[in-house]
Each structure stands twice: as C-alpha cells, then as structure tokens.
C-alpha cells in the first residue's frame, strides 16, 4: 500500500550505548522523507527527526526519560516535497522497529582505568565511573548511578612477562589485588551485567601497566 | 536449553597431543566465561583452566601451563582445549562448564557431559 | 594459591539423617564459594552458590552458610538419591580451586 512513490522504511535498528541511543533503517531516500514516532507500551507517540531525510534519529532524550520502560518506534514515509500525502489507506506509510527496553539492551561502553596505586604487595585499581546521559534531578547520572549492583567490573590483571590473565570482580568502582613484589603488572577491565541474557559484557579498557603515568608506586 | 557437549577424547600416547572441543547451545558463549576441569580416575576435581571468549583471556592450572591451550569461536559458539605433550597424569575426564556471576561471585553452573582422555604407551 | 580444605573425606549416614559438610579456605574468599554435587560417572551439578544461595532446581533441604573462610554444606534430611560425592569451590581468586571431596555413603 502508500503512494507509487514513497517505500516503507526497512531493517529498523537500535544502536545504544551507555544509554546514547539512536534508531537507524534503510532505505537511504529518493524523493522521500522520514518521520519518526517514539512510544512506551502504554504512552502516546511522540514525533521526533521530522521530515528528514537522514536513516538514522537521536532518540536519547526520550528514553533516558525512564530507562527501564519498553519503547516501541516506527519510522513514517512522505514524498519529498509533499509531506501531506498519505497511503491508500489514508496513512502514510510506516514500520514498526523491534522493542527495546534500554536499562535490558544498551549495550555496556568500553570503561577507563582511572588509575592504579601500589602499596606493598597490594594494587588499587579505580575505574571511571562514565556519566551517561540519564538525568535526576537536573544531574547526570553515572553509569553506577543507573545500574547500581547490577554492574559489575572484571578486572584481568597479569605480569607484563606472562600471557595468563587472573580475574578479580568488584561492584564498585575499585579493585583491590595481591601481586608479587617486584613485578610489573598490566591491567585491563570489563564492564558486566550478570543479570542480563544479551549484552552482558563491554569490550575491554584500554591495556594499562605498572611503570606508566597512570600509576603511582609506593614501597612499604 | 543450556547444553555444552565435549567432544575429541581418546587414546594418546605420551608426548601426543589431543584438541578437545565443547559445543555450546542454548546460550551464546561470548557472554560467559567457559571453564574446563578434569578429574581422573578415582580422584576429585581439578580446575584447568578458563577463557573469556569474547576477549580472549585466559589461565591456567601450573600443572598444564605451557602445554594446554583454551581458545574459542565464537561463530561456533564452541571452545577448545588444545593439549600438547600430552604426560600419563593427564589421563582424566575433562569437562568443560559455563561460568555465571552472581554480583561478583562466579560459580559452574552448566556442565558438559565429560570426554576421557587417557594417555598411555 | 588458595587452598580449600573438605572434611570428612568421607561418611557414612542414613537416609533422615542430618549431614554437615565444611570446607575452610586458606585466606579470606569472601563469599566466592561454591558446592557441587556429582555422581558416579556423571557430571558435577551445583547446588549452592554465593556461600548460601540454592541454585534453581535443587530442593531446599540443601543449604550453605559461612563463618569467616568457613563454609558448610548442610543436607538437612538425607534422601537416597543424595548419596554421592560433595566438593566445594572457591572462585574468589585465580586460580580457582576445589576441595578434595565428601563422599557420603549409605551407612
């Protein structure tokens, strides 16, 4: 159905990352032009990206409203230059995206090592808590503000003359580890939400090792 | 339904190598961490090693180190224990089990049905 | 690298019976523990997780606790089909390692 000269949006994607979400679909346009409508299950649509003729609609500022909701998209088709056209059914043409319930499905940006101190035999790993662009009461939450416990971070730690990656886990924002005196460790770490079926891990901090900047180095 | 299914067990001599495979279904293994640990004959459990398939790391036991191998493929949703030099005190069963996390604490709870692996002239 | 000590290595109890398994650590594990349960020629299964949390499935006369780096698995009426072998694991530290084994046999 539509009119001759307009195609229904196709392959509707959510893209999100610590909550920055976005909605992407095809076709690229010929003579045509995008509307999106956001929703909760239960809410009234919202239209956002009027008549653009991007494949892509920053939706971040309507999910971070509630990151735990459901929200459902569509993507509506006009003909370049005459917006007022409808399908044959009176409509214009459109397609629903899947579901997508942000605090389940965003996926998990790759974190930071903030820093790193030994004392002794002991190493303080510390790791950035992101901000995200979930707000509460006029401030920007962290990524430890919106998932709490749920987010956990593996640390992989190892001598810089081995290949063998231990594990620690913590559901802070700090790792306290034992290391044999005297050698130069490295550190990676890994965000992660056990509670989650998809979307459980980020990918790796960048690599950091004792005897660079970040570190400080204290003998007891 | 969660399944990890072992595979490549057998006869080998020592010196010999072996690669063991653990099939993986009903979850996808880059979001876990996937253990193997072997128990001989008669004997109690003992801890391999361990991969992180989505990034690679892995460890393992002193008593293989240098010798074993853990890696995965993910498009298979499978990993695999590579055993080289293979020594009469590697002649076990050997499983291998997806890890889970609650909070921080991580514990086995899925297991293979085991392959043996015997090693003998 | 952290040792897990199991005691008994073994015993001897009826069905009804109350059965107490420890396992101490050698250093602080906080909470990482884990009970498996096997039997002949079968894959472990976990039981409990976390020191005292059932896992889904196992009935509830099954329980772990902890005291320190003690940790007990307790069978608090025993049923013919709980006779096997009992180990605990510790996963607070890499490498993660097991206890020797309970095995509990029919009296």
């Known amino acids: 159905s539509g009119t001759t000269n307009t195609v229904a949006a196709y392959n509707l994607t959510w893209k999100s990352t610590n909550f920055k979400t976005i909605l992407e679909w095809e076709p690229k346009p010929v003579n045509q032009v995008y509307t999106v409508q956001i929703s909760t299950k239960s809410g009234d649509w919202k239209s956002k990206c009027f008549y653009t003729t991007d494949t892509e609609c920053d939706l971040t500022d309507e999910i971070v409203k509630d990151v735990k909701q459901t929200y459902l998209a569509r993507v509506f088709s006009y003909p370049a230059g005459n917006v007022e056209s409808t399908g044959s059914a009176g409509e214009p043409l459109y397609e629903n995206s899947p579901e997508f319930t942000p605090y389940l499905e965003t996926n998990l940006g790759q974190p930071t090592i903030q820093s790193f101190e030994q004392v002794g035999t002991k190493v303080n790993v510390t790791v950035e808590d992101e901000r995200t662009l979930v707000r509460r009461n006029n401030t920007f939450l962290s990524l430890r503000d919106v998932f709490g416990k749920d987010l956990i971070y593996t640390l992989y730690y190892w001598k810089s003359s081995s290949s063998g990656k231990k594990t620690a886990k913590t559901n802070t924002n700090e790792f306290l580890i034992d290391v044999d005196k005297g050698e130069n460790y490295c550190f990676s770490v890994q965000a992660v939400i056990p509670s989650r079926t998809v979307n459980r891990k980020s990918t790796d901090s960048p690599v950091e090792c004792m005897g660079q900047e970040k570190g400080e180095f204290r003998e007891i | 339904e969660v399944q990890l299914v072992e595979s490549g067990g057998g006869l080998v001599q020592p010196g010999g190598s072996l690669r063991l495979s653990c099939a993986a279904s009903?979850?996808?293994?880059?979001?876990?961490?996937i253990h193997w640990v072997r128990q001989a004959p008669g004997k109690g459990l003992e801890w391999v090693g361990y991969?992180?398939?989505?990034?690679?790391?892995?460890y393992y036991a002193d008593s293989v180190k240098g010798r074993f191998t853990i890696s995965a493929d993910t498009s298979k949703n499978t990993a695999y224990l590579q055993m080289n030099s293979l020594r009469a005190e590697d002649t076990a069963v050997y499983y291998c089990?997806?890890?889970?996390?609650?909070?921080?604490?991580?514990?086995?709870?899925?297991w293979g049905q085991g392959t043996l692996v015997t090693v003998s002239s | 690298d952290i040792q897990m000590t199991q005691s008994p290595s073994s015993l001897s109890a009826s069905v009804g019976d109350r059965v107490t398994i420890t396992c101490r650590a050698s250093?602080?594990?906080?909470?990482?523990v884990a009970w498996y349960q096997q039997k002949p020629g079968k894959a472990p299964k976990l039981l409990i997780y976390?020191?005292?949390f059932l896992y889904s499935g196992v009935p509830s006369r099954f329980s772990g606790s902890r005291s320190g780096t003690d940790f007990t698995l307790t069978i608090s009426s025993l049923q013919p089909e709980d006779f096997a072998t009992y180990y605990c694991q510790q996963h607070y530290t890499t490498p993660p390692t097991f206890g020797q084994g309970t095995k509990v046999e029919i009296k």
């Open positions: 089990a997806r890890a889970d996390y609650y909070g921080v604490d991580e514990f086995l709870d899925y």
């Open positions: 009903g979850f996808t293994i880059s979001g876990y961490w």
């Open positions: 976390s020191a005292s």
């Open positions: 991969i992180d398939p989505y990034n690679g790391a892995t």
């Open positions: 250093q602080d594990v906080n909470t990482a």
